[in-house]
């Protein structure tokens, strides 16, 4: 009888194990385990009557197709084998035992007692056949396996092969190389790869194949497995297979579309191809007067590009515009896409005309093309170009006016500062105790008129300032306060400020420039208790022009020393002249000013001990700070006084020979002006000048307006 | 130290002027204005007005105008009050203080008496 | 012109206790500028006044921190935490914000 076993493991015994088992019988174990999996037996007991080539009692194992083994007796000899240690294997997921005994036994024989069990089948090892095994990678687990690909492959459907996915190759470039995948490799299997070659209509691609042609063929039927086709407009050119590369083919289009396939066996390098296109010819182009053109070619065919340039100074002239080069492209009907330009010479036109300044050509007939010359020069002697560079510039190839430090920015005219028309005298009579000073001696000195008429009456006061720039006004910050508010510093408004530059005579103004104020910057920690930080500047409203009555001062480099003591400077002002004029006697007379006539007075630069001892003996608050130093005499005599609030003290810088503002005019007291041992106090402006150039918009040349150490 | 000295006691007939002075010292007289504050016997005070010790400029309250006047000696650092045509209603402590609105610091007094 | 109520008229204080007193102006100080001008002063027995607080809040120098002002708008406060004996005499209150500058009544603080 037959007895049918699934599962992964069993025992198997001969019938009346471990008895003797009985004759004439014939039992039939067929095993059936899952595939992937093998069937391993082996004999734990074996004990069968002996018999040549086991015709007697034997135990048979076998597939459907083969006998693995026969087994009987009790040890092996020449005729008969028993199974000891020995192990089998099905090659299959299914195994068939057959145990058969005669008719007779001579002897007691207890048979057998046999194991089996299902063992994984390690198919990556195993598999010969093409057909069956991966293409790539082989992976077993326990009852099967699966294939995987390499980096840029795919798996087929079929689960084994590996293709690559090559439908997308568009080339749009008029020359190229196109090759199977994985080229001079062999190429993946079960693949259909799709090149385009896609041009411009005009063009036409010619294709070569190069190198090694090697696609699996047949030798009596074309092409079957791999092959190359491709298609050029209506034609299709191919199949192509085998070792023998086509022809060059001129496809006679702009567009080919090739077709590559493969299938899933062999293992062949592929091929190689370069393309490339051609079109029609243009005629040589001709070459410009002054003029060149690259690329230079023997010929020239659709598509090409030429840019035409000129020699240096030089413009191409295209339809009345001039350009730095101009490109034609030779197009499919074999002409160019545009004439060929003309070359111009560069014409830099009419030099920009300068503020405060003037233009002279150095060229015949003033010319303004290229490698002509002009020069700027400033109004002297109120301005001076910055840098003091030569002024000359040169009409470049470009067509632009260009100096050899400036490039093509213009010159800047900045003014003069500190060097009056009129030289300052030396000495000066023993302000208070000053004298008039004569129009155009202080071209600086500015009349700064506040008039409150917000409030009920009206406020009105005035006070001094020195011309730093064209725009710019620098006075005390004082004299800019409003007194309304006390223990606050708040400046006036602007819409109450006038300044009056080149004045002379307060009485007539008709000669002088009055202006009205843009902008009133106070310093930001100017103290009203202590005068700490009395500096401030009035934008005007628009820049006034300079002459012999009305030029900057410069400002002092920004050293914290100020200047030293015993230096003499010079103050102007037209406050109280006479110390015993009263406030009430000069508003009572209707001019606001204290005095007609401009006044000056020189004054030594005190030690600033002797000044700081002179004001902290007295009773009060006073304290001269290290922004602040002091000028006047021991002895009195010669002072400013009211009035003079915010004007400059000037001393002659002996190096460039320029008046320098190193002090305005701030505050003193508490004796009268002019009085013994009662020193004038000044800001000291050195201490200032970041502050001051950072409100003003610092210029690229200090120097110019500010006298460095 | 800031010190407002004022003058003396005065005695006045009906319809005569009186000058008040109040001298100033220990800070910068131009930075602050000066106040002119009224205060009638066993009465509150009573603001007359201010000037402006940079440009000399008198603002005077409604009450206070006509008659009154402010004015100043920069140089001497010394504001004055004048009362012009002295009435009864005028016996009274006039004070001097430093600001026109601040008033942080009181001069002693000046006491104005006018009676026939 | 801004009127200055003060309140109580006086004030009967004992040593080592606290007092306060009321300032209302009929309109609000607050300045366009932001700061509120409200002052207050102490005028003692036979002297002259005294600036105690400026800006609502802000004591002079040498003023003892005994004294606080406070308050916005139209209400405004000074305050005593103990008084001492040398705080006797009138104090006034005073606006510098709306022209002409206006004081109150006074209040007279004085020791039981």
């Known amino acids: 009888h037959t007895v049918e076993l699934n599962n992964m493991f069993g025992q198997i015994q001969s019938p009346g194990y471990p008895d003797s088992y009985p004759s004439d019988s014939e039992v039939t174990w067929n095993i059936t385990v899952p595939e992937g999996f093998r069937i391993k037996l082996y004999f734990m007991h074996f004990n069968l009557e002996s018999s040549y080539l086991c015709e007697y009692d034997y135990v048979k194992v076998e597939t459907e197709e083969q006998v693995l083994a026969t087994f009987c007796g009790r040890e092996t000899t020449d005729t008969e084998q028993t199974p000891g240690q020995e192990v089998v294997f099905s090659p299959g997921s299914f195994m068939s035992i057959t145990f058969r005994s005669d008719f007779s036994n001579e002897e007691r024989f207890t048979g057998f007692d046999a194991h089996y069990m299902a063992v994984d089948v390690d198919e990556c090892t195993e598999r010969e056949d093409e057909e069956l095994s991966c293409d790539h990678y082989c992976h077993n687990y326990i009852g099967g396996y699966y294939c995987s690909c390499r980096f840029g492959y795919l798996l087929h459907t079929d689960n084994r092969t590996c293709r690559v996915e090559c439908s997308d190759n568009v080339y749009t470039q008029r020359t190229g190389v196109i090759t199977s995948p994985d080229f001079p490799n062999p190429y993946p299997k079960s693949s259909e790869c799709f090149y385009t070659i896609e041009l411009e209509e005009g063009f036409m691609v010619s294709l070569q194949f190069e190198d090694i042609f090697d696609i699996e063929d047949h030798p009596e039927v074309p092409c079957p497995y791999d092959y190359i086709k491709i298609k050029a407009g209506p034609k299709v050119l191919g199949p192509f297979c085998g070792e023998k590369a086509p022809e060059p083919i001129n496809t006679e289009s702009h567009s080919v579309q090739i077709l590559f396939r493969s299938d899933n066996s062999g293992e062949n390098q592929g091929w190689r191809l370069s393309y490339r296109a051609t079109g029609n010819e243009c005629p040589d182009p001709e070459l410009p007067v002054h003029g060149k053109i690259e690329p230079l070619q023997a010929t020239y065919s659709f598509k090409d590009q030429v840019l035409i340039s000129c020699d240096t100074g030089y413009k191409v002239l295209k339809d009345n515009v001039e350009m730095d080069t101009f490109q034609i492209e030779c197009l499919k009907d074999g002409t160019w896409s545009n004439r060929i330009p003309t070359c111009k010479i560069a014409d830099c036109g009419a030099p920009a005309e300068l503020k405060h300044g003037l233009i002279t050509f150095s060229t015949r007939n003033n010319l303004t093309t290229y490698k002509s010359e002009i020069q700027y020069s400033c109004q002297q002697p109120y301005y001076k170009m910055l840098h003091n560079i030569t002024g000359v510039y040169t009409c470049s190839a470009q067509g632009v006016w260009m100096n050899e430090v400036l490039g093509r920015s213009q010159p800047t005219c900045l003014p003069v500062c500190g060097q009056p028309s009129r030289s300052l005298p030396n000495l000066v009579k023993r302000i208070i105790g000053g004298r008039n000073a004569e129009p155009g001696l202080f071209p600086w000195q500015a009349l700064i008129v506040v008039e409150d008429t917000s409030r009920v009456p009206n406020d009105k006061w005035f006070g001094s300032g020195a011309l730093l720039s064209e725009s710019w006004i620098l006075t005390a910050a004082h004299v800019l306060r409003s007194q309304r508010r006390d223990n606050t510093v708040t400046p006036v408004s602007k819409e109450h400020v006038t300044v009056y530059l080149g004045l002379h005579d307060v009485r007539d103004k008709s000669g002088a420039v009055n202006s009205s104020a843009a902008q009133v910057v106070l310093h930001p920690d100017f103290n009203i208790q202590n005068y700490n930080h009395d500096i401030a500047l009035v934008q005007l409203r628009e820049p006034v022009p300079l002459g012999p009555h009305v030029m900057p001062i410069c400002l002092p480099s920004p050293e914290p020393e100020g200047p030293e003591p015993h230096m003499l400077g010079l103050v102007a002002g037209w406050g109280i002249s006479n110390p015993n004029v009263t406030v009430d006697e000069i508003i009572s007379s209707g001019t606001r000013t204290l005095s007609d006539v401009l006044q000056y007075v020189k004054l030594p630069v005190v030690p600033y001990a002797e000044c700081k001892t002179s004001y902290e003996s007295r009773s009060g608050n006073y304290s001269v700070t290290e922004n602040m130093f002091c000028a006047g005499y021991y002895e009195g005599g010669k002072d400013t006084c009211l009035g003079d609030s915010g004007g400059a003290f000037v001393i002659l810088d002996d190096l460039s020979q320029r008046w320098v503002a190193q002090g305005l005019v701030s505050w003193g007291g508490p004796e009268e002006c002019g009085s013994k041992q009662v020193y004038g106090v000044y800001t000291k402006v050195s201490n200032y000048v970041d502050w001051l150039w950072e409100q003003m918009g610092s210029p690229q040349g200090l120097g110019d307006l500010q006298v460095e150490r | 130290q800031i010190q407002l000295v004022q003058s003396g006691p005065e005695l006045k007939k009906p319809g005569e002027t009186v000058k008040i002075s109040c001298k100033a010292s220990?800070?910068?007289?131009?930075?602050?204005?000066m106040s002119w504050v009224r205060q009638a016997p066993g009465k509150g005070l009573k603001w007359m007005g201010w000037?402006?010790?940079?440009?000399?400029?008198?603002t005077y309250a409604d009450d206070f105008k006509g008659r009154f006047a402010f004015s100043l000696e920069t140089s001497a650092r010394t504001p004055y009050l004048q009362i012009n045509n002295l009435k009864n209603e005028d016996t009274a402590t006039y004070f001097c203080?430093?600001?026109?609105?601040?008033?942080?610091?009181w001069g002693q007094g000046t006491s104005v008496t006018v009676s026939s | 012109d801004v009127l200055m109520t003060q309140t109580p008229l006086t004030l009967s204080v004992t040593i080592g206790q606290p007092a306060s007193i009321s300032c209302k102006s009929s309109?609000?100080?607050?300045?366009?500028?932001?700061?509120?001008?409200l002052n207050w002063l102490l005028q003692r027995p036979g002297q002259s006044p005294k600036r105690l607080i400026y800006?609502?809040?802000k004591l002079d120098s040498g003023v003892p921190d005994r004294f606080t002002g406070s308050g916005s708008g139209t209400d405004f406060t000074l305050k005593i935490s103990r008084v001492e004996a040398e705080d006797l005499g009138v104090y006034y209150c005073?606006?510098?914000?709306?022209?002409?500058?206006?004081f109150g009544g006074g209040t007279k603080l004085e020791i039981k």
């Open positions: 203080a430093r600001g026109g609105e601040a008033m942080d610091y």
């Open positions: 220990g800070y910068i007289f131009t930075s602050y204005g």
């Open positions: 000037i402006n010790t940079y440009s000399g400029v008198p």
């Open positions: 309109q609000s100080l607050l300045d366009s500028d932001g700061k509120t001008y």
């Open positions: 800006l609502v809040s």
């Open positions: 005073w606006q510098g914000t709306h022209f002409p500058w206006t």
